[in-house]
């Protein structure tokens, strides 16, 4: 057992059928010795008197808000949750399996730039009851200071028949150092509590293996004369590092037809403008990527060739 | 470029980025098979990094650019010896065209233009590499790749910048 | 094409050392390890050790340090071992070859310690 | 260090059979393991690499399977070309061992 928050403990459980469970000894958090009862919720029933309860924690019924009472007051109270191992494996009950990049992949993060700030994200199909707590830190024997906000819930939709929940949070590096080569990766950890269940889920990572640019920003079309090609011209992002000579981009311009079955075109460049033919009811788009490092690249964005 | 003269920012930065790509291209190509065997108790972690205090944020190369190329210079040799080791050279062979050839021969060619004959930077004491078992070796290729990308992704940045900015 | 080429065959007497030669060619000799291999007349095959002709590093069996010395020479594509202080033990036909996945084996070398 | 064992030492067939070499480790060896096969007065000549990969110029009769600290190489249908010793070895930790050897004569 050990101590999630004040008066939280978590109680760890080898989840199989007759498992003995946890001894679990609870204490009152008072100086009176006598008169002392222990209730469980909302329950009346007198589970045991005295200043320690001894508990024998095998199911969820066990587990719950134990409170100690004197005369019809109440002293302290214990929220025991239970996290579950089964087969040597702890329970992933709360979020869903994203599976990208790979299998287990429960918390996925992306950063806009090398700043040291970050989002990640995870879904559950739970929608009450539910309550998130993010640590994170760069390292984790001697941990540098990563700050990270609440938790919120920031989309919701309806796969089939279930509605899915997606929740995020922001972190930010406490001391980052956008030019250096990073050698110890982000920690991130997420404490997920759904009613008297307890799950952890970790993610670790560098930042440079999360970057994915916003989309290229001002992207116009100039037409040459006496031609059917035109040039193309964008900007980099807002949110890419800078100076941009230092963090530099590459881009993929694309052009398509209106047809998913036509032919795409593809240029690439490290410039920020490119000449290509526009046909006629295509589009073109352009995304970008760093340039020395494969991280992922930005969503497209696009402009009609009309 | 040791005692202070300015490298070729130019053929560097050509190069650097040569070296970015052939980093990326040679990554999934250093074995025959998954990497099954976790064994992880040799790991890439003595490799040097180039850290916040050497000097090669845009700031740093502006104030003296010599601290952040000297540090460039170790770790494009450190990688050149990690890159000769049995930990490459050894089963399962690489095929004669694999990009680790060309990764290889470009380290030493970039180490060359930061210091030309003649010229000696103190040079990081290179740790005497023993010989790798042949089962570690997948993993310690696919470790020492990885981190070569991150390696020379920040290399390039220098030299790309110090090319835009700091070229006579 | 690929080709190790070993030194000629060795008469020897008990005491005396004996260095022997396998030449690479058809393949960039730095590139990948050059073993050496033991085998005795009707017996088996027992390595001895191995040289990285890029590094000039070596990894030996516990059973051959002592007896042999591996080197090479990089100008010439050649690797060398070096047996010292022979025995009548030491008498078999020696092989060098390169990685094991890649089936470059030399002719060998027959020694022979003989008074 | 590693023991390769090999079984049968020797073994006496009658062309076109099928015939299946053991080889065992004595302990795992993932798939880091080698099969040659030498000829009377030849060196050594690779037929498997990694337990079970053909080598280019090898007789496609000629098959490696197995992982771990079994392995067995398979015969198709044995030729006449095909006498000579079978050997397996260790190539997955130091120092590299060898089979003893198994014989394949032709009746």
């Known amino acids: 057992i050990w101590e999630l928050k004040k008066d939280v403990y978590v109680v760890e459980l080898d989840w199989y059928p007759d498992a003995p469970g946890e001894m679990v000894v609870l204490t009152c958090d008072t100086p009176e010795e006598d008169g002392i009862t222990w209730t469980l919720d909302q329950s009346s029933e007198v589970l045991g008197s005295g200043k320690t309860l001894t508990i024998q924690v095998k199911e969820f019924g066990d587990a719950g808000q134990y409170t100690c009472h004197k005369g019809g007051e109440v002293l302290s109270h214990s929220l025991l949750l239970l996290h579950k191992k089964e087969d040597g494996i702890w329970s992933t009950d709360i979020l869903k399996d994203q599976k990208e990049p790979k299998n287990k992949t429960f918390l996925r993060c992306e950063a806009k730039n090398y700043s040291g700030r970050f989002t990640c994200w995870w879904l559950t199909t739970i929608s009450t009851d539910l309550t998130f707590s993010v640590k994170s830190s760069r390292g984790s024997s001697d941990p540098q200071g990563v700050t990270c906000g609440a938790a919120t819930l920031s989309a919701e939709r309806v796969r089939g028949d279930n509605k899915e929940y997606e929740y995020s949070v922001e972190c930010q590096e406490d001391s980052a150092c956008p030019a250096a080569e990073e050698s110890l990766p982000i920690e991130v950890m997420v404490d997920a509590v759904h009613k008297l269940k307890y799950e952890n889920y970790t993610s670790s990572f560098f930042i440079r293996d999360i970057i994915k640019p916003d989309p290229p920003k001002n992207l116009q079309l100039k037409p040459l004369k006496n031609s059917r090609q035109v040039e193309v011209s964008w900007e980099y992002p807002d949110t890419w590092s800078t100076p941009h000579s230092y963090f530099s981009l590459t881009f993929c311009v694309q052009v398509q037809g209106k047809s998913k079955r036509e032919k795409k075109d593809r240029v690439f460049t490290d410039k920020t403008s490119a000449t290509v033919i526009c046909r006629k009811n295509a589009s073109i788009s352009v995304r970008a990527q760093d340039r020395y490092y494969s991280s992922s690249w930005s969503e497209w964005a696009s402009v009609p060739c009309s | 470029v040791p005692g202070g003269s300015s490298p070729a920012w130019t053929q560097c930065q050509q190069l650097s980025q040569k070296l970015c790509t052939l980093a990326w291209s040679a990554h999934p190509l250093v074995g025959h098979m998954d990497l099954r065997e976790e064994g992880d108790e040799e790991t890439t972690n003595d490799v040097p990094h180039i850290q916040c205090g050497d000097g090669c944020d845009p700031q740093g190369l502006r104030d003296n650019s010599q601290f952040c190329l000297q540090r460039i210079h170790q770790g494009l040799i450190f990688y050149e010896k990690l890159l000769g080791s049995d930990i490459f050279t050894g089963e399962p062979s690489l095929l004669p065209d694999s990009p680790v050839g060309q990764l290889h021969a470009s380290l030493l060619g970039l180490s060359q233009l930061l210091q030309p004959e003649g010229h000696h930077w103190e040079t990081q004491q290179i740790p005497s590499l023993s010989p790798s078992q042949p089962w570690q070796r997948l993993l310690l290729r696919f470790k020492i790749l990885r981190s070569l990308q991150a390696f020379v992704a920040v290399a390039a940045r220098v030299f790309a910048h110090g090319a835009a900015t700091l070229s006579p | 094409e690929v080709q190790l080429q070993q030194s000629g065959p060795e008469l020897v007497k008990p005491g005396a050392a004996v260095k022997m030669s396998c030449k690479a060619s058809?393949?960039?000799?730095?590139?990948?390890?050059i073993h050496w291999v033991k085998q005795k007349p009707g017996q088996g095959l027992e390595w001895i050790g191995y040289?990285?002709?890029?590094?000039?590093?070596?990894k030996y069996n516990e059973k051959f340090k002592g007896k042999a010395t591996l080197t090479s020479d990089k100008s010439s594509s050649t690797a060398y071992m070096e047996l010292s202080s022979l025995t009548s033990e030491d008498s078999a036909v020696y092989y060098c070859?390169?990685?094991?996945?890649?089936?470059?084996w030399g002719q060998g070398t027959t020694l022979t310690v003989s008074s | 260090d590693i023991v390769m064992t090999q079984s049968p030492a020797t073994l006496s067939v009658t062309p076109g059979d099928r015939v299946s070499l053991s080889c065992r480790a004595s302990?795992?060896?993932?798939?880091?393991l080698y099969w040659y096969q030498q000829k009377s007065h030849e060196s050594p000549r690779l037929l498997i690499k990694?337990?079970?990969q053909s080598i280019s110029g090898i007789p496609s009769r000629f098959t490696g399977s197995g992982s771990g600290s079994d392995f067995t190489l398979s015969i198709d249908s044995v030729e006449p070309d095909d006498v000579g010793v079978f050997f397996c070895?260790?190539?997955?930790?130091?120092?590299?061992?060898f089979g003893g050897g198994t014989k394949l004569e032709i009746k």
């Open positions: 302990q795992s060896i993932s798939d880091y």
């Open positions: 058809g393949y960039t000799f730095t590139r990948y390890l």
């Open positions: 070895q260790n190539g997955h930790s130091f120092p590299f061992t």
């Open positions: 040289i990285n002709p890029y590094n000039d590093g070596t």
């Open positions: 990694f337990a079970s």
């Open positions: 070859t390169s990685n094991w996945d890649l089936d470059y």
